[in-house]
Interface confidence: low
């Protein structure tokens, strides 16, 4: 470790005196940092000598000597005070830059250690420090503002009491930079724009950053636009706003607009699309099938997507029949706006009743005219079945009527014993009717079919069941003959043995 003569650690001299600082080491030694021109530096064997014949207050500072060849990297230091009665401070820097929450060293060095008791830090013009300014003082280094805040970035002066009078240093400007977390925040409004040719339009690109050093520009397709920038500062952030105002838009104004902002942390961009149209438009569509089938008692939401410019002047849901003149309750109609030009309209139909089947139309109007989209709603019903014994053309016949939607299919079963419903074990014969006769098939209503089972003899102690089913459910009716000895006579094409 090198050694400095005089031994120090401090040396106090008067202005004009000669000062010699000698550093001696085992190997070659050198003085750290820039040495001012007022010093003479020469080497004398293993030592390095700094000397000045006319010390001034500006020579006040710490001088450090190192031995480059020392593996331990040792150094020695001496602090020189040149106590000038007119100059209590030697300011090493007029400006100090730190990041927020770092310690800021204001390097005003006291030229006379005796003055340490009367030092203070003030803001420029002798204004007191801001509340909560936590600082400390070292005569060797100056004032340290601990964990500096952005708002503490101001001009400071170091003050020393000399003969009962406060003597100030030149000012030191402290710049406290915010730690930039990332690229500037951006907004581009509107997110989408549609205008009819000849209308006015405005696109606003704004960026905000916690530091003033950032750039922002607006680009149309690949062209950077020259737009005047408005700057502001609020909510502790710098704002830069670019406003593109177009008096009468034309097709060449259409396209992609990008708002781009950058700072030391990088670039951030956001885009929007500007569409210019010849005239007003109104388009209705649905992701749903326009023909809907729902089981009675269940609910359904009918959804219509509307794309329109200019905005809608009116809209409503209408029930077109055929069952009643009721209209959908307004509280069941809901509108949501996906964005400026696209809307979704929903009609909720909970617990559907038979009388609510039919046509539902959504109508909308804007300056482009009227448009309508109509849904056909058919209700699904499980089959209802009834069987009667009748005579047709002199032949005894079982007549099964099944009503439901979708159209039910019909199966006849003959089973042993008297029972309300045939089960698999009891079934003796099964006849499937491939083409039951359709008795009624009106739109939005149940389909009624009938199937005939011609019987020569209905056997006693047996049950004849008509079963109907569709996608919703099934229904059945069991017929038990009263007279014995009868036999059935199904059509040949029906017959199979289970």
């Amino acid at each position: 470790i090198p050694v400095i003569e005089p031994s120090g650690p401090e040396l106090v001299v008067k202005p004009g005196e000669t000062v010699t600082l000698r550093c001696v080491g085992n190997g070659s030694v050198e003085w750290d940092g820039p040495i001012s021109p007022h010093w003479t530096l020469y080497s004398d064997g293993p030592s390095s000598v700094l000397t000045t014949t006319n010390a001034t207050f500006q020579n006040t500072r710490t001088y450090r000597c190192t031995e480059p060849g020392d593996p331990l990297g040792g150094s020695a230091a001496i602090h020189l005070y040149v106590k000038d009665p007119a100059r209590p401070w030697n300011v090493l820097a007029k400006e100090v830059v730190v990041f927020e929450d770092q310690d800021a060293l204001l390097p005003c060095l006291l030229t006379d250690p005796v003055l340490e008791a009367g030092v203070s830090l003030v803001r420029l013009r002798g204004r007191p420090l801001m509340r909560h300014t936590n600082y400390s003082f070292s005569p060797w280094h100056g004032f340290t503002i601990h964990r500096a805040k952005f708002i503490q970035g101001q001009d400071y002066q170091c003050s020393a009491l000399m003969g009962g009078r406060k003597v100030m240093s030149i000012s030191i400007r402290l710049k406290v930079q915010k730690v930039i977390p990332g690229p500037p925040a951006l907004t581009l409004v509107p997110a989408e724009l549609v205008r009819i040719r000849g209308e006015a339009a405005q696109i606003v690109c704004s960026a905000s950053n916690i530091d003033v050093d950032f750039d922002v520009f607006l680009q149309h397709n690949t062209t950077k636009l020259a737009i005047p920038q408005r700057s502001d500062f609020h909510d502790n952030r710098y704002q830069k706003v670019l406003t593109l105002s177009l008096g009468q838009v034309d097709f060449q104004h259409a396209g992609n607009y990008s708002c781009v902002a950058s700072n030391v942390q990088g670039k951030h961009s956001t885009s929007m699309f500007f569409r210019v149209v010849e005239s007003a438009y109104l388009d209705l569509s649905s992701e749903q099938n326009l023909i809907q089938e729902v089981t009675v008692g269940e609910g359904l939401n009918l959804k219509v997507m509307v794309e329109a410019y200019p905005g809608l002047q009116g809209f409503n849901w209408t029930y077109l029949g055929p069952f009643s003149d009721h209209q959908p309750e307004p509280k069941l109609a809901n509108a949501t706006t996906k964005d400026t030009y696209r809307h979704t309209f929903t009609l909720s139909l909970p617990r559907l009743k038979p009388s609510e089947a039919g046509c539902y139309s959504f109508l909308a109007r804007n300056p482009g005219g009227w448009r309508a989209l109509t849904f056909e709603l058919t209700l699904r019903y499980p089959p209802e079945v009834s069987v009667i014994w009748t005579s047709i053309n002199g032949s005894g016949t079982l007549l099964c009527a099944a009503s439901g939607y979708p159209q039910p299919n019909v199966t006849w079963l003959q089973c042993a014993g008297h029972t309300d419903r045939c089960d698999e074990a009891q079934v003796l014969q099964v006849w499937v009717d491939p083409h039951p006769e359709v008795l009624s098939q009106e739109p939005f209503q149940k389909v009624t079919v009938q199937s005939l089972l011609t019987a020569e003899t209905l056997e006693h102690n047996q049950t004849y069941e008509c079963r109907a089913h569709n996608s919703v459910g099934s229904g059945s009716w069991a017929f038990i003959p009263i007279s014995a000895g009868a036999r059935t006579h199904p059509p040949d094409e029906f017959l199979f043995t289970p």
Epitope: A86, L124, R125, G126, R127, I151, G153, Q154, D155, Q157, M168, S169, I170, S171, R173, L174, K175, V176, V212, F233
Partner: antibody
């Protein structure tokens, strides 16, 4: 752009109170580091600094007039005010208001008047 | 109070000449000095701040220098529009004080 304009009574009598208004635009007295000051210049004489008010409502007065001066501001209307009580004929002068603006906003308060109003002439006469 | 003594009180020079105006402070003002230009019927106009920093938009023929108690304003290559009264302002200590002014006339 930054503009300031002073307004006042023009003429008043000794012992009355002089009330001056500085209406400004292009900046706000809520902005960190900003200030407004008042200066006067009697005809044929030099400039005399009267008072400053800062964004944080810090006020500074010329000690020679301190007991007679009051500076205030109305940030919502972009105005600063100066009251001088018990006026004498020696208070006749052109009164200026000026902005003390930031150098590198808002890290360091500026220390000089960077924009001035055109001035308003005040005559104290019996 | 810090007294600011400005000299000369008046000055006459020709177009293209270089002139200097001095301000002497009664004590060290640590570079806290500004220079202004004032034309008749107009507001004062800031030229130099912090002794030597040129205000935005001010022609580079204006320059400020000095330290401690002595400061000067130099105008190179005088132009006709430079005819005006010039004054200094110290803000090192309250009360802020102005120099008495220098009236520059062009021959």
């Amino acid at each position: 752009q930054v503009t300031l304009k002073e307004s006042g009574p023009g003429i008043l009598q000794p012992s009355q109170t002089l009330s001056l208004t500085c209406t400004f635009s292009g900046f706000s007295l809520t902005t960190y580091g900003m200030g407004v000051g008042w200066i006067r210049q009697p005809s044929g004489k030099g400039l005399e600094w009267l008072a400053n008010i800062w964004w944080d409502d810090d006020k500074y007065y010329n000690p020679s007039l301190k007991n007679r001066l009051t500076i205030s501001k109305d940030t919502s209307n972009n105005q600063a005010f100066l009251k001088l009580t018990n006026v004498h004929t020696s208070d006749s002068a052109t009164y200026y208001c000026a902005r003390i603006g930031p150098i590198k906003y808002p890290t360091a308060p500026y220390r000089y008047f960077d924009f001035w109003g055109p001035g308003t002439m005040v005559t104290v006469s019996s | 109070d810090i007294q600011m003594t400005q000299s000369p009180a008046s000055l006459s020079a020709s177009l293209g000449e270089t002139v200097s105006i001095e301000c002497l402070a009664s004590e060290d003002i640590y570079d806290n000095l500004a220079w202004y230009q004032k034309k008749p019927g107009k507001s004062p106009h800031l030229l130099i701040y912090y002794a030597s920093s040129l205000q935005d938009g001010v022609p580079s023929r204006f320059s400020g220098s000095g330290s401690g108690t002595q400061y000067s304003l130099k105008i190179n290559s005088l132009e006709s529009e430079d005819a005006a009264t010039y004054f200094c302002l110290q803000d090192s200590e309250y009360p802020w004080t102005f120099g008495g002014g220098t009236k520059l006339e062009l021959k």
